[in-house]
């Protein structure tokens, strides 16, 4: 059961389906609902991602004939698979041979900055946003997209890598951020929870999400990268919250679909090329930026996130098949493979409108704390 | 004030060669994206080439693939387009056209050079 | 290719009057459109980018709308100087396309 919609200004009203699907007040996570990733992890209970990391799971940019600038991009130490933070059952974890500094897994040992020191620093992600706190800045215009509508050729590798499903995507995607901001993706991935618990890793005034999904580019300023890991700016993500809807989003069935095909962690399949645009809110104005971290080892910092305000709608049914389908490591279910929230530590949390004026039943009284300094178009 | 002024346009036999210009001031020209946009006799508006703003990545529409070529000189604050091979249906008004920083859409155009290609 | 079909293409109103042209994308294109204005003899000028934001300068009796596959541009309140050529472009996927544009004149 739900509140009355919210209007249209209130931050995260409505999935890009079109229809608003408000958090009420019984959406806030209870008491018992909240996991212990939610505190920021101390040392032993530090969890991760950002599915940056990998030689799988970084593609060689290859040049585009005329199209394309020539972009190799360096394959980073392999990562290894994660557990679940929850389930003690999924702390099973197989080691790669040759393979010693780049294991990790969510909820356990090995402590992740002893994986990566950066993981241990101070402007690290996911967050908790909480609008009323953001920081209005018009300066922030709507996002652009280029090139995300695919052929259904040449295929795409879409692959379980024991810590998420992972669709690599080839080159000539371009996202613009604003002057000086121009990226190309990567890959997409996914994050989400099990069976009536929520798996996004970005949580708004600590309302958990069913899930996220991540879209990373890398800066056109860089050729690798290698090269961008710990630049301010180098690595951009695109991320969206997915919610429950009524309906089945055809745009994520074409991948949900597969997902049996690969259960097995390390098991990979082709799918057509799709319109990468549809899997994100149609609503490319409306947004939340800060500069954070990669939210699995290395941790490196210097990443610009961009959290659309408007959410995405999956069916139940598909929210199942995400949480319910893939396998990790040590025979344990690939679920609640997210990172626990990280502390702002003064960082101030953009918003591309003014998100502090919310009209929704959360919102006693706005106040804006924050402000933008730069100016608009 | 943003000013971008398109030249080199003209009269040219079919299967020949032309090297249109197009000079920017006002704004800071290694900024930005910058294409050339054509526009037919029947007023039909197409893209024909863009460049990024280091030259680095390039895009032709497919009908001047391997004809022409585009091309910036940031410390002249010069975008080029080497037409070669013209045929009949490049005849049109050649714009170039600047992009809004950091992003891909249009935001300034030149006056426009007209190219007649004759058999 | 993406395709841009603009409707209508002409059409005559009267100072004061809503004057509403669309265009409908082939395909979705999120809301990566911009509109344009070409008086006679003169080369397109900008008006709207991302499909509803108006550039600075731009009267805000021009509005825009849509998202995904159908756009709308909307002048609230036709002006005489408003006479020109009106045009739509998709900056989703490479080739950008245009509408084949609306004239309007003045009745």
């Known amino acids: 059961q739900r509140l009355p919609r919210m209007q249209e200004d209130s931050p995260l009203g409505g999935g890009s389906s079109g229809e608003d699907d408000p958090l009420g007040e019984e959406d806030l996570p209870s008491e018992e609902d909240s996991p212990r990733e939610e505190d920021p992890p101390g040392e032993e209970d530090l969890p991760g991602e950002e599915d940056l990391p990998g030689e799988e799971d970084l593609p060689e940019v290859k040049p585009k004939s005329e199209e394309e600038g020539s972009l190799k991009l360096e394959d980073l130490p392999t990562v290894e698979a994660p557990g679940d933070p929850q389930e003690p059952q999924n702390n099973a974890h197989r080691d790669k041979e040759g393979d010693d500094q780049s294991h990790w897994r969510y909820g356990g040992d090995p402590p992740w900055p002893r994986v990566s020191p950066a993981c241990a620093g101070r402007f690290q992600s996911p967050v908790d946003i909480r609008p009323q706190l953001a920081a209005f800045c018009p300066a922030l215009r709507p996002l652009e997209l280029l090139g995300f509508q695919l052929p259904p050729l040449p295929e795409l590798r879409l692959r379980n890598n024991g810590h998420s499903v992972q669709l690599t995507l080839p080159p000539g995607l371009e996202m613009a951020l604003g002057p000086g901001r121009e990226y190309r993706a990567l890959q997409l991935h996914l994050h989400w929870g099990a069976a009536g618990r929520p798996g996004s890793e970005h949580t708004v005034e600590g309302h958990r999400f069913p899930a996220e999904i991540h879209v990373v580019h890398l800066s056109t300023a860089f050729a690798r990268v290698d090269e961008a890991l710990g630049r301010p700016g180098g690595l951009a993500v695109l991320a969206a919250f997915l919610e429950e809807g009524p309906e089945e989003n055809s745009a994520y069935e074409q991948l949900l679909s597969r997902l049996e095909e690969i259960a097995e962690e390390g098991s990979e399949t082709q799918v057509p090329g799709l319109d990468i645009s549809a899997l994100l809110p149609s609503d490319f104005s409306r947004y939340f930026q800060y500069e954070g971290s990669l939210t699995t080892p290395p941790c490196a910092q210097g990443v610009i996130w961009t959290v659309f305000n408007q959410t995405v709608m999956l069916s139940a049914k598909q929210l199942h098949t995400l949480s319910d389908t893939l396998w990790g490591p040590g025979d344990s279910r690939l679920q609640l493979n997210f990172r626990a929230t990280q502390p702002l530590n003064g960082r101030v949390i953009e918003a591309s409108f003014p998100a502090g004026v919310d009209s929704s039943p959360r919102a006693a009284e706005p106040v804006q704390l924050n402000s933008c300094l730069a100016a608009g178009d | 004030d943003v000013k971008l002024v398109e030249s080199g346009g003209g009269l040219v036999k079919l299967g020949g060669s032309l090297k249109l210009s197009c000079a920017a001031s006002?704004?800071?020209?290694?900024?930005?994206?910058m294409s050339w946009v054509r526009q037919t006799p029947e007023k039909r508006l197409e893209l024909v080439a863009a460049?990024?703003?280091?030259?680095?990545?390039?895009y032709y529409l497919d009908t001047v693939k391997g004809r022409f070529t585009i091309s910036r000189d940031n410390a002249k604050n010069t975008l080029y387009l080497q037409m070669s091979s013209l045929k009949s249906e490049d005849t049109a008004l050649f714009y170039c056209?600047?992009?809004?920083?950091?992003?891909?859409?249009?935001?300034?155009w030149g006056q426009g050079t007209s190219v007649t290609v004759s058999s | 290719d993406i395709q841009m079909t603009q409707s209508p293409s002409s059409l005559s109103a009267s100072v004061g009057d809503r004057v509403t042209i669309t265009c409908k994308a082939s395909?979705?294109?999120?809301?990566?459109v911009a509109w344009y204005q070409q008086k006679p003899g003169q080369a397109p000028r900008r008006l709207i980018y991302?499909?509803?934001n108006r550039y600075t300068g731009v009267p805000d009796r021009f509005s825009g709308s849509g998202s995904g596959t159908d756009f709308t541009l909307t002048i609230s309140s036709l002006q005489a100087e408003d006479l020109a050529d009106y045009y739509c472009?998709?900056?989703?996927?490479?080739?950008?396309?245009f509408g084949g544009g609306t004239k309007v004149e003045i009745k």
């Open positions: 056209a600047r992009h809004r920083s950091g992003y891909f859409s249009m935001d300034y």
């Open positions: 006002g704004f800071t020209f290694s900024n930005y994206y």
């Open positions: 460049i990024n703003s280091d030259g680095g990545i390039t």
């Open positions: 395909q979705n294109v999120v809301s990566a």
């Open positions: 991302s499909a509803s």
């Open positions: 472009q998709q900056y989703s996927n490479y080739p950008w396309t």
